[in-house]
Interface confidence: medium
């Protein structure tokens, strides 16, 4: 059989070899496709509901005005010429549809080195047959289950059109000390040969290297954080890292609207200053690193103060509810 590929929705003409160019003709077409239960016979006389799907042209060819998925199958023509010589034509028809350009959705802008990260999900819609999605790093194919690469794939079929939607989610574990701006792309390869791959626009997430920092120390004066009304409390955030990181302050987890500073002075303490304080050190190349939380409280004369560094308070909270 001769292999024929036809694009879904396009017309298709199949020649009946050996048939006289015009009537009278002795020929018949036999079809075994998704539209037929077994072999369906079509003659030049035609007529009936099949004419909208396939009909025999005056020259004996079979004409399909718009090929669909159900037209995949075997088409055979048997013709006899004026001298009584019989000729057979045999076609294997396969249909295809090229999807739209694949896209990467839910893409990460930043990855963390040394841990698994979701890079994004590649989506291709409207293909037939299904085809495949593959990922590339800096132009080279990524092999799933190798070097911290994993891919989760899903194929769905549209209940009415029969076309496929493919999804591929890429997870990678970037190596420490590797490329800080890797380039990822995804490509769709059609299920039928001779059609070129379609590639997404590339994405370039940053890779963040978490560097273990020495601990951030929060020093409270007076020790224990208990002070009489009107007294002063000094909080000092000590970070051994060089160059010195920026220091932000939190009260009850609420970011305090203050310029970055390693020292926070609470003069003339009142009830509104009571709460849980911590500092956050942010270095340009590291993530934020917070100190322990310490409790600041007011004691009336004769009261015992709480122990140093008791953790509690009411929340990384309400500033900048943008």
């Amino acid at each position: 059989a001769q292999n024929i590929t036809a694009r879904i929705g396009e017309p298709l003409v199949l020649k009946c070899k050996g048939a006289p160019k015009k009537p009278p003709q002795r020929l018949e077409w036999k079809l075994n496709t998704g539209r037929t239960e077994a072999w369906k016979v079509l003659s030049p006389q035609g007529g009936g509901p099949w004419d909208s799907v396939a009909r025999v042209l005056p020259n004996g060819s079979l004409f399909l005005p718009a090929v669909g998925i159900q037209d995949e199958g075997i088409f055979r023509c048997q013709a006899m010429n004026r001298n009584g010589k019989e000729t057979k034509s045999n076609y294997r028809v396969r249909v295809y549809q090229i999807p739209g350009k694949p896209e990467i959705v839910d893409s990460a802008s930043e990855l963390t080195a040394g841990v698994p990260n979701k890079v994004g999900t590649c989506v291709s819609e409207g293909s037939y047959p299904a085809g495949t999605l593959s990922w590339h790093l800096d132009g080279k194919p990524l092999v799933p289950n190798e070097k911290g690469v994993s891919v989760k794939e899903q194929t769905r079929r549209h209940p009415e059109t029969g076309l496929f939607t493919l999804q591929s989610e890429l997870m990678v574990t970037p190596a420490r000390g590797g490329d800080p701006r890797p380039t990822f792309s995804c490509s769709f390869s059609p299920g039928l040969p001779r059609h070129r791959a379609l590639r997404t626009a590339p994405i370039q997430p940053r890779v963040w290297e978490p560097v273990p920092l020495e601990e951030v120390q929060l020093v409270v004066e007076p020790e224990g954080g208990a002070v009489a009304p009107g007294g002063t409390v000094t909080l000092t955030c000590e970070v051994p890292a060089q160059p010195s990181p920026q220091i932000h302050w939190m009260k009850d987890g609420v970011p305090l609207p203050l310029p970055p500073s390693p020292v926070l002075i609470l003069p003339e303490i009142g009830p509104q200053d009571q709460g849980t304080y911590s500092c956050v050190a942010t270095h340009s190349s590291h993530g934020p690193q917070e100190s322990r939380a310490v409790s600041i409280s007011i004691i009336e004369p004769g009261e015992e103060g709480p122990t140093a560094g008791s953790v509690g308070g009411s929340g990384l909270g309400t500033l900048a509810l943008a």
Epitope: D106, V280, A320
Partner: nanobody, 117 residues
Framework: AVQLVESGGGLVQAGGSLRLSCEVS????????VGWFRQAPGKEREFAAA????????YYAASVKGRFTISRDNAKNTVYLQMNSLKPEDTAIYYC??????????WGQGTQVTVSS
């Protein structure tokens, strides 16, 4: 862009429990502190709980302390809010928010929690 998606809300009877999840995508998860906020009908949005970058520090509003527990799973890019002994006054839309350094820059769409008496 960083995206936050809350789930786990629903209808529960007073005294019951729910676990809310907040999945953070599009950024290095361990760079974000995450907070839960809630907004009851006709009221201002209020802070409920938060967890710091490392998970070492947790914070709670007085109204939920002892009943709610916040935790994070850095492998799953998810923060959880376990809510026990729920009361009708806990009925609200619960939002999660992510903080890079000093403000909550990114917000989810919210999940509805309804506690019936």
């Amino acid at each position: 862009a960083v995206q936050l998606v809350e789930s786990g809300g629903g209808l529960v009877q007073a005294g019951g429990s729910l676990r809310l999840s907040c999945e953070v995508s599009g950024g290095a998860f361990s760079r974000y502190a995450v907070g839960w906020f809630r907004q009851a009908p006709g009221k201002e949005r209020e802070f409920a709980a938060a967890i710091s970058w490392s998970g070492n520090n947790t914070y709670y509003a007085a109204s939920v302390k002892g009943r709610f527990t916040i935790s994070r799973d850095n492998a799953k890019n998810t923060v959880y809010l376990q809510m026990n002994s729920l009361k009708p006054e806990d009925t609200a839309i619960y939002y999660c928010a992510a903080m890079l350094v000093s403000t909550y820059d990114y917000w989810g769409q919210g999940t509805q929690v309804t506690v019936s008496s």
